[in-house]
């Protein structure tokens, strides 16, 4: 008789999740010599321990603490790039500008990027059928708690000038309910962070509006200013040219506004 299984509203654990996490860990430690001491089997065991046999609506930051310890890493605090709803461009940028880091450029972020996972209470099984949806089921699910934990700590680590890439094509360029808006903004440390600089990425070829005047950007500025952090904003009118100029800053066309 098949055992009754809780049906959640979200997609189930990513296929071959254990193998994927382990393979990503090995690849990351090969690419980053400073992390070659990391024992990827221990990393997987700690990751698994955070959610296996636990109710997937009752996960805490504490569950991920063993994994956090194993993911200890040097991140230059003044080279942090946050992003919201524009992950691909942010990652393209840090692939070129190698001294800057998004969360997904760290081991922990790299391991979990684009993956879904959850377990079941009192069994050692991974649930590949369904996992809790943040809105429809519960917010304290394994994926949401993981990203909240690492995002909070990534923001806490930032200093000096922190950059954030925002999607100018969205109706809410700054969304208070995004991870950036609900977690990272509130965990920047005013004694360490001098300025938050927003880069608003334009979508349309002919879009010459100043999106730094958008009401949601003004809302972000207000939140940041109240936290005693300075705010600045730049329009990136041509993201393709922006990336090209990061690659080749000497190019004569890169002196004009991008």
């Amino acid at each position: 008789v098949p055992r009754w299984r809780q049906q959640w509203s979200g997609p189930g654990t990513t296929k071959r999740f254990p193998e994927t996490v382990l393979a990503r860990c090995v690849k990351y430690t090969e690419i980053h010599p400073e992390m070659r001491h990391v024992d990827c089997q221990s990393v997987w065991d700690a990751f698994k321990g955070a959610f296996i046999s636990k109710h997937p609506c009752n996960i805490t930051e504490e569950d991920y603490q063993p994994l956090m310890k194993l993911g200890t890493q040097t991140v230059p605090c003044n080279k942090i790039l946050l992003w919201s709803r524009i992950k691909d461009l942010a990652h393209q940028f840090t692939q070129v500008q190698r001294d800057m880091f998004t969360l997904e450029d760290t081991l922990l972020g790299y391991l979990a990027d684009d993956l879904t996972w959850c377990g079941e209470f009192n069994t050692s099984k991974i649930n590949y059928q369904s996992c809790p949806d943040w809105r429809k089921d519960c917010s304290n699910n394994p994926v949401s708690v993981f990203w909240k934990t690492v995002s909070r700590r990534f923001a806490e680590a930032a200093c000096d000038v922190v950059h954030v890439m925002l999607n100018g094509s969205r109706s809410k360029i700054f969304d208070k309910n995004s991870t950036f808006g609900s977690v990272e903004v509130h965990n920047l440390q005013p004694e360490k962070v001098q300025t938050l600089e927003a880069w608003v990425i334009h979508g349309g070829r002919e879009d010459s509006r100043d999106l730094c005047q958008d009401p949601t950007i003004k809302e972000l500025e207000s939140i940041i200013s109240k936290r005693n952090i300075q705010f600045s904003c730049k329009n990136i009118y041509r993201p393709d040219k922006f990336l090209q100029c990061v690659k080749n800053p000497e190019d004569s066309s890169c002196t004009s506004e991008i």
């Epitope: 956090m68 993911g71 200890t72 890493q73 230059p76 003044n78 760290t106 690492v150 990534f154 680590a157």
Partner: nanobody, 117 residues
């Protein structure tokens, strides 16, 4: 600007003890969790211990649990690490850092601990 200065390292025999200190400035020390991390020769960064801002909560790596004790004196803006029963594998440069990790950008020069007979 956050600044830290570690001291107290040295050469010690296996089984011996050392007390590391970290003098901090440029931020409200008591508001921040503080950590010790270490880097052994040719190895990566390893988290050692963290203490909460108030000092009432501590956490240790399994490899040092029961041998090392982290503490702080907020009035002196100083972080400590008492290291007992030292082993050869504890040889490393020890850094203090603000925050609880896992992402660290240590600001000090560190202090070298060498455990050798």
């Amino acid at each position: 600007e956050v600044q830290v200065l570690e001291s107290g390292g040295g050469l010690v025999q296996p089984g011996g003890s050392l007390r590391l200190s970290c003098a901090a400035s440029g931020f409200t020390f008591s508001s921040y969790a503080m950590s010790w991390v270490r880097q052994a020769p040719g190895k990566g960064l390893e988290w050692v211990s963290t203490i909460s801002g108030s000092g009432d909560s501590t956490d240790y790596a399994d490899s040092v649990k029961g041998r090392f004790t982290i503490s702080r004196d907020n009035s002196k803006k100083t972080l400590y690490l008492q290291m007992n029963s030292l082993r050869v594998e504890d040889t490393a440069v020890y850094y203090c850092a603000d925050g609880r990790g896992p992402f660290f950008d240590y600001r000090g020069q560190g202090t070298l601990v060498t455990v050798s007979s």
